[in-house]
């Protein structure tokens, strides 16, 4: 399948560097509740050979573990294949490499199919600027406002950042 969004001007390399998770959304609320499999936080990203590499922070036992994941390119420019708690079709929905990134994933784990969206920003002080865009993308793909969780500093594993 293919999503008709455009990849960032200048290519994926512009996504490299530090990011901060601002909001999550899902049609299965348990996935993004504390200790949910998709309540994870971006630390940094890099791109190589068209693939996206991400370091994410996962809360575990009161601490945060850094895990490296790779989302592999597909024939569609904004779509990637990611193995994390099953198979994910990962789509870059809106990208401004200097400011914010909105992605969503269709997750298949055993016989269950779920939808998860993620808003991340470069500068946390500007997070409010991009929440309307996130709400708009979520609504468009079938996620409602009450399915969005806006993260706080405590949620984000801020203490685990280098």
């Amino acid at each position: 399948q293919e999503g008709n969004h455009e990849e960032p001007q200048g290519g994926l390399e512009e996504l490299s560097g530090r990011w901060h998770s601002v909001a999550l959304a899902s049609n299965k609320s348990d996935l993004i509740k504390p200790w949910g499999h998709f309540r994870v936080f971006i630390h940094s990203m890099s791109a190589k050979d068209g693939n996206l590499h991400g370091d994410i922070l996962i809360p575990q036992d009161g601490q945060c573990e850094k895990v490296s994941l790779t989302a592999f390119k597909t024939a569609t420019s904004n779509k990637f294949d990611l193995e994390y708690w099953g198979h994910n079709d990962l789509y870059l929905a809106e990208v401004d490499p200097k400011s914010y990134l909105i992605l969503y994933m269709i997750n298949q784990y055993n016989d269950d199919t779920s939808l998860v969206a993620h808003l991340m920003v470069r500068d946390l002080s500007r997070q409010q600027d991009f929440l309307p865009a996130f709400e708009s993308v979520c609504e468009d793909i079938g996620l409602h406002k009450d399915q969005i969780v806006v993260l706080s500093d405590d949620d984000r594993c801020q203490g685990s950042r280098d």
């Epitope: 999503g3 049609n27 298949q108 939808l115």
Partner: nanobody, 124 residues
């Protein structure tokens, strides 16, 4: 729920084009992700294309990518499937489906309404 009625099917030759329509009535059309599926004789129903609620995003099965185009007109409560360069393997009954979200591409669980289907036959 919405009620869905497909039209536009028929018998065409390989290489020809066809445009399917699906008219919706009932609840607000723009609240739904819309999909086309198809079912060939003796085969399972398969995903063809989907379009997000506003029409901003479209999704296609690999087998139709570059040949088929899904679009929607929310004021008219209609979704379309433009099918170009048809091949014999496209022969099937084509179903319109409304879904709560885009997971309908991967799972029928998100589908809330189905149309009755329209037959497309591609001959050589």
């Amino acid at each position: 729920q919405v009620q869905l009625v497909e039209s536009g099917g028929g018998l065409v030759q390989a290489g020809d084009s066809l445009r399917l329509s699906c008219a919706a009535s009932g609840r607000s059309f723009s609240n739904y992700v819309m999909n086309w599926f198809r079912q060939a004789p003796g085969k399972e129903r398969e995903f063809v294309a989907a379009i997000s609620r506003s029409g901003r995003s479209t999704f296609y099965a690999d087998s139709v990518k570059g040949r088929f185009t899904i679009s929607r007109d929310n004021p008219k409560a209609t979704v379309y499937l433009q099918m170009n360069s048809l091949v014999i393997e496209d022969t099937a009954v084509y179903f319109c489906a409304a879904a709560s979200d885009i997971t309908s591409m991967r799972s029928l669980a998100a589908i809330t309404s189905w149309g009755q289907g329209t037959q497309v036959i591609v001959s050589s």
